[in-house]
């Protein structure tokens, strides 16, 4: 009996092939792993993405797929190769029984296997039965350049391309990879099928209500009429974009992914590859009122992940749920009651809400920025989006308490001028995942490939930590934080900056023998101090110890507790100058801050001393925040004195280069 969706109609019972005997065993000591969606209802067992090792060629992928079919046939199992991936990730998509997973994991070249899972449109309501006139206020919103040099790819539902908002602006590609709609009585109605994609295309580039009115778009259908798709379909869509880019290279590309599924290693990996090929990916954080790191592609570090706020800059509530939050969100954008094209008719408008709408706003802003400065890299674009955002306007009380410090308080905004930001030294703060509570647990925060790690700090809610250090990993510096015995875990916090032609290194001093404290300085000619870190092996640094002695007025020196090793980040870059700002408080307060003034950028943020009542230090925009235990639990002894140390830098070279351009 033929399978209802016809998926098995081409199945071939592969006979035992000669190739079968040639199966090489996987390299000794490397074990392929199996992954599946943590959210059970979203799993799609029976379909698997087999991801092969990075250097695997297409011919090897095809051979591995055939080998799997042959070995499965010997065991009496039917398999169907649905797609062979190349161009983005090597691998293949296979329909097979879960019984074959053990066999598949042992195939040569296999890196990991992921069970397919669902992804969903991130707008609520799916379609409002309401027609709203367009909000056209040309006097209020006339961007200087509507993103005309940029192509925006939209991976979504089908769209109504003849809607007057987007007519002539959106090219519907022939790409379609969607699952069957759920339910036997589902009635496909064109306007419902097109609703989500049409609205988002309008938000990005609509004539009246669009952000980047000049941007051209291409749509790929990866979500069905119910707004549902699959990880595998999205992967094939991303591969399609990469192949299009290779066949016909155009200007800057922005890819909008207004969808979310459970955490997916393979979807994140594909996004990473596409981002490293120079494509800007923007995605919805998700509408689950949850940590965005639990969803994909929201959790992919290379993707710009957007949460939703309303007109009052408050996080959007969507029924019982709402916008996602946490360290995987880059910034927020308007996502409540957004007026845009409705697929009910070619002149209809409708209001929709969700992180999809927020992501569409940011995709539009990105298109405009890239149109003004087509050479911007992903890292430069992300830093500019952060820099020009409205700061500290979101009511953080909406977020769970443990997520407030991790969630960026940033709402996307168009830059006041699309040119002339080149002189600025841009930095952002990157939080690691939580280390977990074990004694030797560590957490690692990393910068993007073309960013410099200029400083490293750590934070623990319990105060039990063993500091942090900058260390080399794969030819790049990373920030590693260390948990302490009895601690609930730590975060590492990296300060990641755009510093062209920089040469940075870490200078370390081991714990000092003398009671003077440990110190380390930047001794190389032309190198300036951009950050200080300290790490210690003792469990409770500083308790009943003599106070830390710090030399007066030493801008190029890191100083710390005598039982700690101290790490100085020292950088040489054209025109780079830095200064230290040190704010001390005489008695414990829950927070002490120190900010860099206009024209200077915070590169380093640390706390002195490293004693156990200091929870840690982290940068929020241009302010260094040092958090301590509650005053009432610490008392007001001299042991309670805390100092926040900020290192503020600027680049005279960038400023001069910018002036020469003008």
């Amino acid at each position: 009996q033929e399978d209802e969706d016809g998926d098995y109609e081409e199945l071939v019972l592969a006979l035992r092939s000669e190739e079968d005997g040639l199966a090489e065993a996987p390299e000794h000591g490397t074990t392929a792993t199996f992954h599946r969606c943590a959210k059970d209802p979203w799993r799609l067992p029976g379909t698997y993405v087999v991801v092969l090792k990075e250097e695997t060629h297409l011919s090897q992928s095809e051979r591995t797929a055939r080998r799997l079919q042959a070995q499965a046939a010997r065991r009496g199992y039917l398999t169907k190769i649905l797609h062979v991936f190349h161009g983005l990730l090597p691998g293949f998509l296979v329909k097979m029984s879960g019984d074959l997973l053990e066999l598949a994991l042992k195939l040569p070249h296999v890196d990991y296997i992921e069970e397919d899972s669902s992804v969903f449109a991130q707008s609520i309501p799916w379609n409002l039965e309401r027609i709203t006139p367009p909000r056209y206020r040309a006097d209020e919103y006339q961007p200087p350049d509507g993103g005309s040099l940029v192509e925006v790819y939209l991976l979504d539902t089908s769209i109504q391309s003849d809607h007057r908002e987007i007519e002539g602006r959106v090219m519907v590609t022939d790409f379609e990879n969607v699952p069957e709609e759920d339910g036997t009585r589902f009635h496909r109605q064109a306007s419902k099928c097109d609703s989500h994609g049409t609205h988002l295309a309008g938000v990005v580039s609509g004539r009246d209500a669009g952000v980047a009115k000049g941007a051209s778009m291409r749509s790929l259908r990866v979500l069905n009429c119910q707004g549902k798709g699959t990880v595998s379909g999205t992967l094939i869509g991303l591969e399609f974009i990469r192949k299009s880019q290779l066949v016909q290279p155009v200007g800057p590309l922005v890819v909008l992914l207004p969808l979310a599924g459970g955490y997916s290693r393979v979807l994140n990996a594909a996004c990473q590859r596409l981002a490293r090929a120079g494509v800007v990916l923007v995605t919805a954080a998700g509408n689950f009122r949850d940590d965005a790191c639990l969803y994909s592609p929201a959790s992919a570090p290379e993707v710009i992940t957007v949460g939703a706020t309303n007109a009052q800059d408050q996080p959007v509530t969507l029924g019982t749920l709402g916008t996602n939050f946490g360290r995987c969100v880059d910034l927020f954008a308007p996502g409540e009651d957004i007026i845009g094209a409705s697929s009910d008719c070619s002149t209809c408008f409708v209001s929709q809400s969700g992180t999809s709408q927020a992501a569409a706003h940011v995709a539009g802003i990105a298109a405009m920025m890239l149109s003004a400065e087509p050479e911007l890299t992903l890292a430069e674009l992300r830093q500019r989006l952060i820099h020009f955002s409205a700061k500290d306007v979101i009511n953080e009380a909406w977020f769970p308490e443990d997520q407030r410090v991790l969630t960026p308080n940033l709402v996307a905004a168009l830059p006041p001028s699309t040119h002339g930001a080149g002189w600025q030294l841009f930095c952002r703060t990157v939080w690691s995942a939580h280390s977990g509570p074990t004694r030797m647990a560590t957490a690692v925060a990393r910068c993007a490939p073309d960013e410099e790690l200029l400083s490293c700090s750590s934070f623990s809610r319990s105060g039990k930590r063993r500091g942090e250090r900058m260390e080399a990993q794969g030819g790049k510096l990373v920030c590693r934080a260390h948990n302490a015995f009895g601690g609930e875990g730590v975060y590492a916090i990296a300060r990641c900056c755009l510093l062209p032609q920089a040469n940075c290194s870490v200078h370390t001093a081991p714990p000092a023998e003398a009671s003077m404290g440990t110190r380390v300085h930047c001794h190389q000619q032309g190198h300036v101090l951009t950050g200080c870190s300290s790490h210690w092996e003792v469990e409770d640094l500083g308790t009943h110890k003599p106070p830390v002695l710090r030399p007066r007025g030493q801008p190029n020196q890191c100083v710390g507790h005598r039982e700690a090793s101290i790490h100085a980040s020292c950088c040489h870059a054209p025109g780079l100058e830095c200064k230290v700002k040190e704010h001390g408080i005489p008695a414990p307060q829950e927070q002490v801050t120190v900010a860099c003034e206009e024209g200077w950028t915070l590169t380093g943020c640390s706390a002195l001393p490293g004693t156990s009542h200091v929870l840690g230090a982290y940068a929020v925009d241009n302010t260094c925040v040092v958090r301590s235990r509650d005053v009432s639990t610490t008392g007001s002894t001299s042991e309670g004195a805390v100092t926040a140390v900020a290192i503020c830098c600027r680049s005279r070279h960038l400023a001069q280069a910018s002036q020469e351009l003008q």
């Epitope: 801008p555 700002k581 704010h583 001390g584 927070q591 120190v594 004195a641």
Partner: nanobody, 127 residues
Framework: QVQLVESGGGLVQAGGSLRLSCAAS????????MGWFRQAPGKEREFVAA????????PYAHSVKGRFTISRDNAKNTLYLQMNSLKPEDTAAYYC????????????????????WGQGTQVTVSS
Amino acid sequence: QVQLVESGGGLVQAGGSLRLSCAASGRTFSVYAMGWFRQAPGKEREFVAAITSPGDSIPYAHSVKGRFTISRDNAKNTLYLQMNSLKPEDTAAYYCAATKSGNYNYMGPDPKKYHYWGQGTQVTVSS
């Protein structure tokens, strides 16, 4: 150089108020933070409060928090200390101090990191 001159001290009843002023002159553009310290007879110099020109985070000594308020008028190059609900233990000579701005900028309770000092003004609180 920066010159600092305090004024406003005197004798006051417990529970009363005083407002101290500190006028800065000279190279005031080179000042980063300004602060108040006090020294009772036979005791070490004690930090009271400090402020930077942008008025960042303002630290106060635990013993004066909620009663004393520090402020700064940049246009007049003057630092103030509003002292309310005074207690006999607030009796001391009150000194104004300033730190330099430059590559290393300090605001906090460590008197050794202050570069410029005034002559002091006496505050006596009687019970």
